[in-house]
């Protein structure tokens, strides 16, 4: 038969950050190719990445149609010379992925501090709202648009001259914190979805940004904007 020498895919794994979602699997193909299918629990199978020699398939376009649905994918293995007209009636070997619910399982991407501004003993720190590939009508939505108040940010801040960190939390993208006069501070933020109970509750920390660096001096009486 046409599928005798093909092996089923294995180690099917979802890799997803801010809803950019790729299914990966093994093995690297030798004389075989793969086709991926994806469906919701109640939907029909849709084929993607037809007869590919890759071991990954970008399924973002499918999952962003409804990020709160649960999806299942499967990977079919075909002989490398396979074309649809071969007439083989035997079902090719395939393997199912774990279920995947994007809203609950996509990883939070590393956030970025957009700006900070000091006025006297207050500093306003703003976190950049990341764009996702989720759409409403023809408009791309931001991370905040999708997660709303499910998403919070944690700010870690410390005096440049010491290592003792303080924290603040916000369910917006802004922090207003008290600082000591005449001291320079460093900042890092982390995105968090508190209602998650798994390892993907938190993003990695943002790059550290410090006051008083060459992009502009903070002035106790003035404003300091730090933009990427």
């Amino acid at each position: 038969s046409g599928t005798t020498n093909t092996v089923a895919a294995y180690n099917l794994t979802w890799k997803s950050t801010n809803f950019k979602t790729i299914l990966e699997w093994e093995p690297k193909p030798i004389n075989q190719v793969y086709t991926v299918q994806i469906s919701t629990k109640s939907g029909d199978w849709k084929s993607k990445c037809f007869y590919t020699a890759d071991t990954e398939c970008d399924l973002t376009d499918e999952i962003v149609k409804d990020v709160k649905q649960t999806y299942l994918a499967r990977v079919f293995s075909y002989p490398a010379g396979h074309v649809e007209s071969t007439g083989s009636t035997e079902e090719p070997p395939y393997e199912n992925s774990p279920e995947f619910t994007p809203y609950l399982e996509t990883n939070l991407g590393q956030p970025t501090i957009q700006s900070f501004e000091q006025v006297g003993t207050k500093v306003n720190v703003t976190v950049q709202d990341e764009w996702t590939l989720v759409r409403r009508n023809d408009t791309f939505l931001s991370l905040r648009d999708v997660f709303g108040k499910d998403l919070i940010y944690t700010l870690y801040y410390w005096k440049s001259s010491s290592s003792g960190k303080k924290t603040a939390k916000t369910n917006t993208n802004e922090f207003l914190i008290d600082v000591d006069k005449g001291e320079n501070y460093c900042f890092s933020v982390q995105a968090v979805i508190p209602s998650r109970r798994t390892a993907n509750r938190k993003s990695t920390d943002s790059p550290v940004e410090c006051m008083g660096h060459e992009k502009g001096e903070s002035r106790e009486t003035g404003h300091h904007h730090h933009h990427h």
Epitope: K68, T101, L104, V127, D129, R136, L141, T172
Partner: antibody, heavy 120, light 113 residues
């Protein structure tokens, strides 16, 4: 079609407890917050709190902390509101509602309401 | 907690009228991250559950007639019904959907003149 179907009316004595159920269908139950809203006769709407069935994570309005408890059974797609030590002022219609698809986009679907009457 | 204040508390109008209901929040409902206002409007008829009309201050929920529109930003918001229909006589509520605890306005009862 998204539906939230609540349990029937209840008549309870002061000091008793009541458990209201809200059976969801037509959507992925675990990914949407279930909201609970109280409406006393002839009065406005009061948000009690919410629960995310996926994790059991809850938020409570301080006015209801202690006597109201939210729970969810994902195997039967049902959320529950339990109120203990009932008082006359707990007489109200209790609604469950489902959060919208987008972040902070309101309560898109509502149950029909459950009337709880507390009277001796 | 964010307080929501609606005005007027009640309002009499006729079919075909243009009606405006206002809602004021004690704190800004504008999200700095995405520049959206998390203010929601509902309609409720006697003996029925509320119905979502508008979210994000100005986005009409699917299936809601175009005569309903929402506007405003920060702390001041408006629900406008451009030409009242018989089925629009009901009570309208605004809601803070920005931060916990979520809070409703006291309601505006729209009655037939």
């Amino acid at each position: 079609e998204v539906q939230l179907v609540q349990s029937g009316s209840e008549l309870k004595k002061p000091g008793a407890s009541v458990k209201v159920s809200c059976k969801a269908s037509g959507y992925t139950f675990i990914t949407y917050w279930i909201e609970w809203v109280k409406q006393r006769p002839g009065q406005g709407l009061e948000w009690m709190g919410d629960i995310l069935p996926y994790s059991g994570s809850t938020n409570y309005n301080e006015n209801f902390k202690g006597r109201a408890t939210f729970s969810a059974d994902t195997s039967v797609s049902t959320a529950y509101l339990q109120i203990s030590s009932l008082k006359a002022e707990d007489t109200a219609v209790y609604y469950c509602a489902r959060s919208g698809y987008y972040g902070n986009s309101g309560f898109a679907y509502w149950g029909q309401g459950t009337l709880v009457t507390v009277s001796s | 907690d964010i307080q929501m204040t609606q005005s007027p508390s009640s309002l009499s109008a006729s079919v075909g009228d243009r009606v405006t209901i206002t809602c004021q929040s004690s704190q800004s409902l504008l999200s700095s991250g995405n520049q959206k206002n998390y203010l929601t409007w509902y309609q409720q008829k006697p003996g029925k559950a509320p119905k979502l009309l508008i979210y994000w201050a100005s986005t009409r929920e699917s299936g809601v007639p175009s005569r309903f529109s929402g506007s405003g930003s920060g702390t001041d918001f408006t629900l406008t019904i451009s030409s009242l229909q018989p089925e629009d006589f009901a009570t309208y509520y605004c809601q803070n959907d920005y931060t916990y605890p979520l809070t409703f306005g006291q309601g505006t009862k729209l009655e037939i003149k």
